[in-house]
């Protein structure tokens, strides 16, 4: 048993460039950026703008560019190696139990309260008891954690320990 | 059309051995990990084991690991489950699956039609 | 281990109606813009087959009346209108972490 290979352990040959429209598998896996062709012998590039691959992979397909809805602004376009990054438009919100749909922020706090944060494209404005300075809304989710253990970093497959 | 047919099932006594096989088909075997499943009856599914392409890394759940080895043979499109020191809580249908691999092993994208395995005395 | 409760254990729906499942992890599965959480359905005498991978990707050959959300730790699997050969148990898959863990399936049935 052995942990999976990094891109580190790679012969420099088998490190996919990017303008490398085809190359060929290591292990039977893809870098990022690009999917495994039928046969399994060459990784093929990803389309930019339309599909991507953020990990090491045995995809047949790359997986498809996330299309941001109306009512959402895109931060940052699909590439190769990442998907589109959407956030919903100024006065309006994500919330965690409903990610699917940006939500209007609220206008004002209700009587008795004061705004202690603003609307954000990912919390409703924060609101606490004058007195007691106790929150009316939820906490603001944490920023997504970047956790190094599976499924890795884009750069590197890591492993399930075996 | 990939084809994944497992064998070797049977009637075992606890601390006995068994060996499953599957023959696969269809897709280009020496480029994909493979794994087995299994379902004990009437419940829910359990990873049992994968293994990459090559056969050099492998991956099993504290629930099976120094009791299962998973192996392949390329050359035969095959892959085999070694299993000793079985238990009445080993008596399942055991799967043989193609699995996708994604940042880590992923998601199970084909199943074979199952093996049944009974431990009992 | 990630541990993943499914919701309801039964569900018993009416032809053509919309049917809901719910996956929640014990803790998030999500990192770099993807969510690591896939779905199977299980028709009774049958092995289990894949629906949806990474939350929300629909597999090839699948029809376009199934579809998943969600991300961090609740996840959905959606049946928009249910048919008869719908009927089966639903499974969710988590392959964030090792071991990788399976939530415990809901029985979808016609009411």
């Known amino acids: 048993e052995s942990a999976l290979i990094t891109q580190q352990d790679l012969a420099p040959q088998q490190r996919a460039a990017p303008q490398q429209k085809r190359s060929s598998p290591s292990e039977g896996l893809c870098p990022p950026g690009h999917h495994i062709s039928e046969d399994g012998r060459d990784c093929i590039s990803c389309k930019y703008g339309q599909d991507y691959s953020t990990h090491w992979n045995d995809l047949l397909f790359c997986l498809r560019c996330t299309r941001c809805d109306s009512g959402e602004v895109e931060l940052s376009p699909c590439t190769t190696t990442r998907n589109t990054v959407c956030q919903c438009e100024e006065g309006t919100f994500r919330e965690e139990d409903s990610p699917e749909m940006c939500r209007k922020c609220r206008t004002g706090c209700p009587r008795g309260m004061v705004k202690v944060g603003d609307c954000t494209p990912w919390s409703d404005i924060e609101c606490v008891h004058k007195e007691s300075g106790t929150k009316h809304s939820g906490e603001v989710p944490a920023v997504e954690e970047t956790v190094t253990s599976s499924p890795g970093t884009p750069a590197s497959p890591c492993s399930l320990s075996g | 059309e990939v084809q994944l047919v497992e064998s070797g099932g049977g009637l075992v006594q606890p601390g006995g051995s068994l060996r499953l096989s599957c023959a696969a088909s269809g897709l280009p075997f020496n480029s994909y990990y493979m794994s087995w499943v299994r379902q004990a009856p009437g419940k829910g599914l359990e990873w049992v084991a994968a293994i990459n392409s090559n056969g050099g890394r492998i991956h099993y759940p504290d629930t099976v690991k120094g009791r299962f080895t998973i192996s392949r043979d390329n050359a035969k499109n095959s892959l085999y489950l070694q299993m000793n020191s079985l238990r009445a809580e080993d008596t399942a249908v055991y799967y043989c699956?193609?699995?996708?691999?994604?940042?880590?092993?992923?998601?199970?994208?084909?199943w074979g039609q199952g093996t049944l395995v009974t431990v009992s005395s | 281990d990630i541990v993943l409760t499914q919701s309801p254990d039964s569900l018993a729906v009416s032809l053509g109606e919309r049917a809901t499942i719910n996956c929640r992890a014990s803790?998030?599965?999500?990192?770099?813009?993807?969510?690591?959480m896939h779905w199977y359905q299980q028709k009774p005498g049958q092995p289990p087959k894949l629906l949806i991978y990474l939350s929300s990707n629909l597999e090839s050959g699948v029809p376009d009346r199934f579809s998943g959300s969600g991300s961090r730790t609740d996840f959905t699997l959606t049946i928009s209108s249910l048919q008869a050969e719908d009927v089966a148990v639903y499974y969710c898959q988590q392959s964030y972490e090792d071991p990788l863990t399976f939530g415990g399936g809901t029985k979808v049935e016609i009411k």
């Open positions: 803790e998030s599965v999500d990192i770099y813009g993807n969510s690591f």
């Open positions: 699956t193609r699995l996708t691999y994604y940042g880590n092993p992923a998601w199970f994208a084909y």
